[in-house]
Interface confidence: low
């Protein structure tokens, strides 16, 4: 902790500017008024303060706002955000998407830190739901964000937000998460025509029930094997050989290469050998 010392004559800061980089830590503590700092936070990032000097500036803000910083200060924290602990951030009430973007920008290119995770959690919980603009922003910065949420958290995603989801945002989602997201996607894309609908829904199909797969098999969708392999085993098992053939179209030949893997293996074991033989792939039930 920096000792309280009087500010030397003539060194009292009238504004936040480059002259402060020559101040020692104790001079910053003594000569920079915390309220002045708070109102001119936007200038701090343009000044090449050392990490030690930033510690002093953070300390001054902490003293001025022991209950947590106001959003007007948070929005302009810039690199000072990297000095915050999750404990600091839990005191904040961030409601503006612009503030969230400004802070995510500071951390851009790095993995999601506990500070950022706490910030996002505060922001989303404060809004009450993960709306489209927020999801758009978060997945732009962190493509894996959606799959880092629990099924319970995903349940607060409104169907309208699903339009912001890109296929790569779902790469690391597990079946429990897709179970929650699929019905929302189905609702979001329900007014699209067949081929367009399939392009949009494809990434979410790991959460699709049997009846939806049966319906898709009637629409000449030509599902690729990568998508088929991600389907729920319990949803695939009741499909007939004819339905799988229609679902996969020209990709049906790929079943041979996947015959030892779930869900193909389990599905093959469920089928009559006569039916499998109609595929001409040499699959053995």
């Amino acid at each position: 902790e920096v000792e309280k010392t009087a500010c030397p004559s003539g060194k009292k800061a009238r504004e936040i500017d480059e002259s402060l980089i020559f101040y020692k830590k104790w001079e910053l503590e003594a000569c920079v008024d915390a309220a002045l700092l708070a109102t001119q936070m936007d200038r701090v990032n343009a000044i090449p303060f050392t990490y030690e000097q930033l510690d002093v500036l953070k300390h001054k803000l902490d003293e001025l706002y022991p209950q947590g910083y106001p959003e007007s200060v948070i929005q302009h924290l810039g690199y000072l955000f990297l000095k915050m602990s999750p404990e600091d951030i839990r005191k904040w009430n961030v409601t503006s998407l612009e503030t969230l973007k400004a802070l995510l920008e500071v951390n851009k290119g790095h993995e999601m830190s506990p500070q950022v995770a706490t910030l996002i959690d505060r922001f989303v919980k404060g809004r009450g739901q993960l709306d489209k603009d927020t999801l758009d922003t978060l997945t732009a910065f962190y493509p894996g964000y959606l799959c880092s949420l629990s099924p319970e958290e995903l349940s607060s995603v409104p169907p309208s937000s699903i339009w912001a989801v890109r296929p790569q945002d779902l790469d690391t989602c597990d079946p429990r998460q897709l179970d929650v997201l699929y019905p929302k996607a189905r609702l979001a894309f329900q007014n699209m025509n067949g081929s367009e609908y399939f392009v949009k829904i494809q990434s979410f199909l790991g959460g699709a029930p049997t009846e939806d797969l049966k319906a898709l098999s009637q629409q000449n969708v030509s599902m690729d094997l990568a998508t088929f392999m991600k389907l729920r085993t319990d949803a695939v098992l009741p499909l007939t050989v004819a339905e799988v053939q229609k679902l996969l179209g020209p990709h049906v030949e790929g079943l041979k290469a996947e015959e030892r893997h779930r869900p193909v293996r389990d599905w093959i074991l469920r089928q009559r050998q006569d039916d499998l033989d109609t595929l001409g792939l040499g699959l053995q039930g």
Partner: nanobody
Framework: QMQLVESGGGSVQAGGSLRLSCTAP????????MDWYRQAAGNQREWVSS????????SYADSVRGRFTISKDPAKDTVYLQMNSLKPEDTAMYFC????????????WGKGTLVTVSS
Amino acid sequence: QMQLVESGGGSVQAGGSLRLSCTAPGFTSSDCDMDWYRQAAGNQREWVSSLLSTDGSTSYADSVRGRFTISKDPAKDTVYLQMNSLKPEDTAMYFCRCVVAEWGGMDYWGKGTLVTVSS
């Protein structure tokens, strides 16, 4: 009321190591963001490290980064603080804290374990 229990403190020479443990009997550590704090005699309590429940990511105060490591064993509902290259200025009472990972969540503290580092 949940009670966290710290252990593993003790006396050690500068440069030595200790591993602190924090258990929450009857409570799942996966429900918590887990923090370690410390308080040296006559000083304010200061944050040392955090481990988030959501994705297991970790964070450290500048004064301990590179020397301390926070981790957890979900099977035992125990959170650890591995402290290496200890310095005399690390001497303090160490506390663990569980912040129930919810908006405006409850938090729970342990009674602390003392770490003394002599030069």
